[in-house]
Interface confidence: medium
């Protein structure tokens, strides 16, 4: 399908003018390539009326012209003194009129309505109101005043100051008459209907001294705003419908195959399942406008939108409507990211978010979809640092790989971290992309102590496990703070060797603190990596107490909670005073805790990374 | 539209104290992220402190364990409590407000600055 998009159809009344935008996707070929607008002849063959390399046919000499906007994606074609022989079938492209780069478009003209002298038109979308006014003469201000509807030869009375109404009008009509002095009655309508359209006439009194005034009210169809957009991007539906409806239910809608509107989203809590996870209803502002979001967009959720307002919060005849005809470029320049991202209950997840490449200095944020009424979606972190505490310790925000994509790391999942978030910039909003966890059954693959209790002064290890799979990853430690993980520095990890043949069950990464002080309490991460690419998490947290004992040298989980299937950890633990406490000489052989002295080096912190096999403990 | 004013700059003497305010004229409770920037002449603006709607606290290094950020939602005000100050710490202090509306779109807005001069 050609990714060239317009107005599939475009009517307008002899001697008007015409302005018609074509949209195309704005890759540096594209902008630069020849536009063009043609018609189409019997023959099947397209004649080329206007260029945007100054081509003007014969026919359309000073009245028409191209203007290409290569930073939007948009050429516009504007026909001005328009004839019924403008009618026909045309197309707008790009390149070649042949080469199927294009868009068809149908252009109707009509001849004007034949109207009687001295009459008022008024045009007026469905919907919203008119007023029309109907001048007297003083003579005529006691006598009965009244409008009628020529329907063919004959008139039908709407409504008269006697207090009569026509069924039709019921509740959405009225007549007033002003005070004394002021010669001119007016009809207001309100809600107007298709049906409504049509040649009214004002009447005062009756007989030959009668007042009478024509009005031609024209009751249009909102004309569909054209909205051009990436796959997998976001769009924004803003609908402004007035201050009269401020107070009423609202919703958007999409016209379907039978010409009815199914329901996308209403203030009134429904909302259609193939949108979940992936709109919001923003809330009104005090004027009664609001704005409709949907991200992920999908080549099925093309077609004509309507945003209107009815109490029972779905599109009702006579009620104010705005349009939108939405077409999902498949060209997109937004990448394929996963949709779906699946973790195991206590383990972790890593999340790419594109953003738009050239806006590398905008910031990046996630936040997770609500669904409870309109939804909305709570921000967890940005790319200046965490947002809600309550993700402490299992949540960053990562500016790698860079160049149009961050990376999302949350862990210590539980099911209740199972959901749809947003990725999301202060940039370009056409970027935002939504991402649903799922939690699924198993094991996570990295696996370290519970929390631990670190000795002020003495050394700490902390070892973490990770299976074969891993053996070709980069490894890391890393302390997490509200702003980020800084890895921690890294020894230098032994003959290559040690993973090529991976026959054992798991593989060490350690963690060394020497000596530990106050500021080493915290949270740190183990992780894997891939270049800039990152994979699973485990996370432990550091309680830093002073030495209880002269010369003891223990760790301690803070509560008891070592990881599962932590089998290592769990030889020589002994209870005292309900604080497990596990026995040093594991340690010793674990590399969880070493002597109190220096390591090599001195380095405060490390990481040594080797096989189980290499220290010397039981293998799981 | 919120709009932000910002108060307590002046003179101090190195090792004194000041303590900045920044008032919203709208509630700040929807305002995710509220923070101090600075910028010095001839140098580029800054982050001094942010905290978060959730009370998250991050600090520039070169003014952790000086300064403070607090946030008072009830009277729409985040202040800085700036202790120890440095002549170094001489620049023009603005407050910022990140608004992080449902549908993602993020409007940050600035205030107009107060200046801090500290002398040796």
């Known amino acids: 399908k050609s990714p060239v998009f317009g107005p599939q159809e475009v009517s307008s009344v002899e001697g008007n003018s015409v302005s018609i935008k074509c949209y195309y996707p704005p890759t540096s070929v594209n902008r630069h390539t020849r536009k063009y607008w043609c018609r189409k002849g019997a023959s099947g063959r397209c004649i080329t009326l206007v260029s945007s390399e100054g081509y003007v046919s014969s026919n359309y000499a000073g009245r028409a012209n191209l203007t290409n906007f290569p930073e939007n994606g948009t050429f516009v074609v504007n026909i001005a003194q328009l004839s019924r022989d403008d009618s026909g079938h045309y197309k707008c492209g790009l390149g070649i009129n042949s080469r199927g780069l294009s868009f068809d478009v149908s252009l109707e003209v009509s001849q004007g309505p034949e109207l009687p002298n001295g009459t008022e038109v008024y045009t007026v979308d469905v919907g919203r109101t008119v007023t029309i006014k109907c001048p007297f003469k003083t003579e005529n201000a006691p006598k009965t005043k009244a409008l009628y509807k020529k329907i063919g030869q004959t008139s039908v009375l709407v409504i008269d100051s006697r207090n009569y109404v026509n069924p039709n009008y019921k509740d959405r009509i009225r007549l007033r008459i002003p005070g004394t002095g002021q010669l001119i009655f007016t009809v207001v309508i309100d809600r107007l209907r298709l049906s409504d359209h049509g040649l009214y006439l004002c009447q005062a009194g009756d007989g030959s001294n009668r007042d009478e005034k024509n009005a031609d009210l024209q009751v249009l169809e909102p004309e569909p705003e054209l909205v051009y957009e990436d796959l997998r991007g976001s769009v924004t539906f803003h609908c402004a419908l007035g201050l009269e409806v401020a107070n009423v239910a609202k919703f958007l809608c999409r016209v379907n195959s039978r010409e009815t509107c199914d329901v996308v989203i209403n203030t009134l809590g429904k909302r259609d399942s193939a949108f979940e996870g992936r709109i919001l209803l923003n809330p009104q502002d005090k004027d009664g406008s609001f704005s409709v979001v949907i991200t992920g967009l999908r080549k099925e959720d093309e077609g004509r939108y309507l945003c209107g307002a009815h109490s029972d919060g779905q599109l009702q005849e006579g009620w104010p409507i705005q349009a939108w005809q939405l077409f999902v470029n498949e060209e997109s320049t937004i990448p394929r990211s996963p949709t779906v991202v699946k973790g195991v209950a206590g383990g972790s997840v890593a999340v790419l978010c594109p953003y738009n490449p050239k806006e590398s200095q905008s910031l990046k944020y996630w936040c997770l979809w609500e669904g409870a009424q309109n939804g909305r979606c709570p921000l967890l972190v940005e790319s200046q640092g965490l947002v809600q505490e309550q993700y402490e310790g299992r949540l960053s925000l990562l500016q790698e790989p860079g160049n149009g994509t961050f990376t999302v790391i949350l862990n210590q999942l539980t099911t209740q971290d199972a959901g749809f978030y947003w990725c999301l910039t202060n940039g370009d909003t056409r970027w935002r992309t939504t991402v649903e966890i799922k939690i699924i059954e198993g094991e996570p693959n990295l696996k370290v102590p519970g929390n631990v209790t670190a000795v002020l002064g003495e050394t700490l290890n902390i070892p973490c496990h990770f299976p074969c799979k891993f053996s070709s990853y980069e490894k890391y430690w890393c302390k997490w703070s509200n702003t980020g993980c800084q890895t921690l520095p890294s020894q230098d990890e032994g003959p290559s060797e040690a993973f090529v043949n991976c026959d054992e069950n798991s593989r060490l990464v350690s963690l060394t603190l020497n000596p530990v002080t106050r500021a080493d309490e915290g949270w740190y991460w183990c992780g894997v990596k891939q270049g800039h690419f990152y994979g699973e998490t485990a996370a432990v947290y550091v309680a830093v107490e002073e030495k209880k004992v002269a010369g003891s040298r223990y760790v301690s989980p803070a509560k008891a909670d070592a990881a599962p299937d932590e089998k290592v950890l769990d030889s020589g633990v002994r209870e005292i005073e309900n604080k497990a406490i596990q026995d040093p000489r594991l340690f010793a052989e674990e590399k969880v805790v070493a002597d109190t002295g220096d390591q090599a080096g001195g380095s405060r912190a490390s990481v040594d990374s080797s096989s189980s096999e290499e220290q010397g403990g039981s293998s799981k | 539209e919120v709009q932000l004013v910002e108060s307590g700059g002046g003179l101090v003497k190195a090792e004194g104290s000041l303590r900045l305010s920044c008032v919203a004229s709208?509630?700040?409770?929807?305002?995710?992220?509220m923070g101090w920037y600075r910028q010095a002449p001839g140098k580029e603006r800054e982050l001094v402190a942010r905290?978060?709607?959730?009370?998250?606290?991050h600090y520039a290094e070169s003014v952790e364990g000086r300064f403070t950020i607090s946030r008072d939602n009830a009277k729409n005000t985040v202040h800085l409590q700036m202790n120890g100050l440095k002549p170094e710490d001489t620049a023009a202090y603005y407050c910022?407000?990140?608004?992080?509306?449902?549908?993602?779109?993020?409007?940050?807005?600035w205030g107009q600055g107060t200046l801090v001069t500290v002398s040796s």
């Open positions: 905290i978060s709607g959730g009370g998250i606290t």
């Open positions: 709208t509630s700040i409770a929807s305002i995710n992220v």
């Open positions: 910022k407000a990140d608004v992080f509306a449902s549908s993602g779109h993020v409007t940050t807005y």
